[in-house]
């Protein structure tokens, strides 16, 4: 029950996180005009990964896409790439995790397969979250660098009569959305990995086996692995040797003075 809850919660948290990463990537407010200590203008500038916008005081907003690919800063391209990789990995992770959910029964899928899928999706969520956090952090670092550079420029070369106002940019809402979303995806991924441990069969999960001396040869029964189907049933694999070793689950067990447990 706890495993199912952990897995389900991990899935939901990751889903919210990935939705947030997608939202952050699409948002225009990655950087917004810094209004502190600046002359009050009737125009507000903000920029995203894909376009820059200007909102006039009247409410009129004009956005222009970055139609060049080669002319854009390498850092911006890197951020775009990180966010897209994060979204793609997250989307694949979500797809995998749907099939891995313990509460969803798909054919005769074993717990070991579900465990592997849960682990795979968990790792994908972790990497997706890290990509988003890295992308947002790279952009934030770029903003901080540019902010102090433009601040330095503001206080130099003002000897003439004409003053030039340098537009400085600060953190936009998308950065915070991205950080939170990346964190949620990461947490969701960790939860999926934890859930995987509870789903995975133990390495030597054989029940107590009775051995008794038989003839000279022990014949191996063909079709040695029994795969148990059925939701919630014991899916532990049992190797069955005819006359040699039988599990306690087997009804016909003939104890004799040679038996050891």
């Amino acid at each position: 029950m706890a495993v199912t809850a952990c897995q389900g919660l991990g899935f939901v948290v990751s889903l919210i996180g990935i939705a947030g990463i997608i939202a952050a990537t699409c948002m225009d407010q990655w950087s917004t005009q810094d209004l502190y200590n600046n002359p009050v203008t009737a125009v507000f500038n903000y920029q995203g990964l894909w376009r820059s916008c200007v909102r006039e005081s009247s409410g009129f907003t004009e956005c222009r896409g970055y139609f060049t690919l080669l002319g854009l800063p390498a850092m911006l391209q890197a951020v775009r790439a990180l966010m897209i990789v994060g979204i793609v990995l997250g989307a694949i992770g979500l797809l995998v995790s749907i099939f891995a959910l313990k509460c969803i029964r798909i054919g005769s899928m074993e717990d070991s397969a579900k465990a592997n899928m849960t682990l795979t999706s968990g790792i994908m969520f972790i990497v997706s979250g890290l990509c988003a956090i890295a992308g947002v952090s790279v952009f934030a670092n770029m903003l901080v660098t540019n902010f102090w550079m433009s601040t330095a420029n503001m206080y130099t070369g003002m000897g003439g009569m004409v003053q030039t106002v340098q537009t400085r940019y600060t953190f936009g809402a998308a950065l915070f959305v991205g950080w939170v979303a990346g964190g949620l995806t990461l947490i969701g991924g960790v939860m999926m990995c934890i859930a995987c441990r509870g789903l995975a069969p133990e390495e030597t999960n054989y029940k107590a086996v009775s051995y008794h001396a038989s003839g000279h040869s022990v014949a191996y029964k063909p079709g040695g692995f029994k795969a148990s189907t059925g939701f919630g049933s014991n899916t532990k694999n049992k190797k069955i040797y005819d006359g040699g070793a039988r599990t306690e689950d087997e009804v016909q067990s003939y104890p004799s003075k040679h038996d050891y447990v």
Epitope: P39, T41, V43, N45, S58, G59, T167
Partner: antibody, heavy 118, light 113 residues
Framework: QVQLQESGPGLVKPSETLSLTCTVS????????VHWIRQPPGKGLEWIGV???????NYNSALMSRVTISVDTSKNQFSLKLSSVTAADTAVYYC????????????WGQGTMVTVSS | DVVMTQSPLSLPVTLGQPASISCKSS????????????LTWFQQRPGQSPRRLIY???TGESGVPDRFSGSGSGTDFTLKISRVEAEDVGVYYC?????????FGGGTKVEIK
């Protein structure tokens, strides 16, 4: 069509409060704001302030302590209040619609002459 | 506050001849975000209210004759009348529409010689 009409007392005593109303038609007050501008006799234009469609206001720093611009959407009216008036406030007062593009002023009222005298 | 300086104060012109009015601002009116200059030109005919001719420094208002054109960027702007007509007589103002408070230039009076 877009119309703006200023109204108010033509004569105000010094130290009193000047109250003007701008009645508008032909446009939505939720989309457009209004600027107030004045022009002393024989002189140039002086921007007083603006109230934007969202309700935010900006004023001329020289008049900020004395001026208030407000809107009454139910009456389709904008109002200007200027306190502690002196003879220097004698002017033609205009209201003008805040243009949607370029932060300009696209339609102007005819203006109303206000004289400050005892 | 941003200071808008217009020149000349008075501009006597001959009908059919071109006219040019200069406007300088103490701070740049160019917005880096959209590369637009927030400068507006107004015309005030004698006894009338002002009307907007040009916004964004060079975009003509609808209904304004195309003999009026605006140019310039940053701090230096110009209003040109390609061929002056009798109805162009009046005072022309430039306005800063970028920084609060919005400020007007002192005005340039265009009159026929």
């Amino acid at each position: 069509q877009v119309q703006l009409q200023e109204s108010g007392p033509g004569l105000v005593k010094p130290s009193e409060t000047l109250s003007l109303t701008c009645t508008v038609s032909g446009f939505s007050l939720t989309t457009y704001g209004v600027h107030w501008i004045r022009q002393p006799p024989g002189k140039g234009l002086e921007w007083i302030g603006v109230i934007w469609a969202g309700g935010s206001t900006n004023y001329n720093s020289a008049l900020m302590s004395r001026v208030t611009i407000s809107v009454d959407t139910s009456k389709n009216q904008f109002s200007l209040k200027l306190s502690s008036v002196t003879a220097a406030d004698t002017a033609v007062y205009y209201c003008a619609r805040a243009a949607y593009y370029g932060n300009g002023l696209d339609y102007w009222g005819q203006g109303t002459m206000v004289t400050v005298s005892s | 506050d941003v200071v808008m300086t217009q020149s000349p104060l008075s501009l006597p012109v001959t009908l059919g001849q071109p006219a040019s009015i200069s406007c300088k601002s103490s701070q740049t009116l160019l917005n880096s975000g959209n590369q637009k200059n927030y400068l507006t030109w107004f015309q005030q005919r004698p006894g009338q209210s002002p009307r907007r001719l040009i916004y964004w420094a060079s975009t003509g208002e609808s209904g304004v004759p195309d003999r009026f054109s605006g140019s310039g960027s940053g701090t230096d702007f110009t209003l040109k009348i390609s061929r002056v007509e009798a109805e162009d007589v009046g005072v022309y103002y430039c306005q800063n529409a970028y920084f609060y408070p919005f400020t007007f230039g002192g005005g340039t009076k265009v009159e026929i010689k």
